[in-house]
């Protein structure tokens, strides 16, 4: 049965450049190994932002990526991307692959539009 991946359509990053959003898939397959990839789409180009493999024992992911973190619980991944700046505003897609045991399944969400607004620099104070 095909998997459907859902993610919110819009997220606003915090003033510190942090955006968090869930990525869920259904139906929930009995899977030992789930690979989650965050992709950024600009025009017709897709680039990988970060990727990780979750297992029953390893539910904290993206340890190799300084700007991504995530936790996995059943069929839901809570993703956080940090270090974002206004130029990083764009559509971020969540791809889920059920890697093991076979058969392999893959699904992709429709994307989360992340808006990033650079904070105004603090004005110099006169003492």
């Amino acid at each position: 049965e095909a998997i459907q991946v859902t993610q919110p359509s819009v997220v606003l990053a915090s003033s510190h450049g942090v955006a968090s959003f869930p990525c869920e898939y259904s139906p929930s397959h009995n899977t030992d190994e789930v690979r989650v990839t965050v992709l950024r789409q600009t025009n017709d180009q897709m680039t990988e932002v970060c990727a990780t493999t979750f297992t029953e024992k390893n539910t904290v992911g993206f340890l190799d990526y300084p700007f991504c973190s995530g936790t996995f619980n059943e069929s839901r991944v809570n993703l956080t991307i940090q270090g974002l700046r206004a130029v990083d505003t764009g559509l971020y897609l969540c791809k889920v692959e059920l890697m093991y045991p076979p058969p392999y399944f893959v699904g992709m969400g429709n994307g989360t539009q992340i808006y990033v607004i650079d904070p105004e620099p603090c004005p110099d104070s006169d003492f």
Epitope: A2, Q4, P103, Y104, V106, G107, M108
Partner: antibody, heavy 119, light 108 residues
Framework: QVQLVESGGGVVQPGRSLRLSCAAS????????MHWVRQAPGKGLEWVAV????????YYVDSVKGRFTISRDNSNNTLYLQMNSLRAEDTAVYYC????????????WGQGTLVTVSS | EIVLTQSPGTLSLSPGEGATLSCRAS???????LAWYQQKPGQAPRLLIY???SRATGIPDRFSGSGSGTDFTLTISRLEPEDFAVYYC?????????FGPGTKVDIK
């Protein structure tokens, strides 16, 4: 430019073994999933097997499970297909193909190598 | 496994005409993970369309793909002499990654 060159095909008797190789060049081999696809004479395409970029995950079509083994050597940019207990219905041109990075469709193919299983 | 059915089996047309090729899946798969390939005699297949509607690099814009769910279409707006070939659809949403049986486009 991307190049995939298969070798190892030939005529073999039923029940015997054969190992196909696919030499890859022109791209970062260790970043891509690699596939074998076959085509029996005058017939359509049949996907056979895939091995993920790191070699950890492998999947096969049911008709070859337990007989064929896909493997790769990322240090030598080479893909392999070990074929055991060959049957007449395995006769085909075998292509190696690169799985595109964002989905397992095949953006580059080799020229194919013919395997004939006959007594 | 997902079974793909292509129709018609053969399409006899003249250069300059348009062609519509159909691919139907036995069940839906995720995210329109469907590709189209062209194969000429004695050659390896060539990727035309992926993601149901995205043209591969270097593919002319007379080729277009559409569809979702279980029904997909490859359209060739005006057939050029080099377009007469066999066309295969392939799903890559779940293993095994199956192909359709092909549609042969030949010259009338």
């Amino acid at each position: 430019q991307v190049q995939l060159v298969e070798s190892g095909g030939g005529v073999v008797q039923p029940g015997r073994s054969l190992r196909l190789s696919c030499a890859a060049s022109g791209f970062t081999f260790s970043s891509f999933g690699m596939h074998w696809v076959r085509q029996a004479p005058g017939k359509g395409l049949e996907w056979v097997a895939v091995i993920w970029y790191d070699g950890r995950n492998k999947y096969y079509v049911d008709s070859v499970k337990g007989r064929f083994t896909i493997s790769r050597d990322n240090s030598n940019n080479t893909l392999y297909l070990q074929m055991n207990s060959l049957r007449a219905e395995d006769t085909a041109v075998y292509y190696c193909a690169r799985g595109e990075f964002f989905g397992e469709f095949f953006d580059y193919w080799g020229q194919g190598t013919l395997v004939t299983v006959s007594s | 496994e997902i079974v793909l059915t292509q129709s018609p089996g053969t399409l006899s047309l003249s250069p300059g005409e348009g062609a519509t090729l159909s691919c139907r899946a036995s069940q839906s798969f995720s995210s329109n993970y469907l590709a189209w390939y062209q194969q000429k005699p004695g050659q390896a297949p060539r990727l035309l369309i992926y993601g149901a509607s995205s043209r591969a690099t270097g593919i002319p814009d007379r080729f277009s793909g559409s569809g979702s769910g279980t029904d997909f279409t490859l359209t060739i707006s005006r057939l050029e002499p080099e377009d007469f070939a066999v066309y295969y659809c392939q799903q890559y949403g779940t293993s095994p990654f199956t192909f359709g049986p092909g549609t042969k486009v030949d010259i009338k």
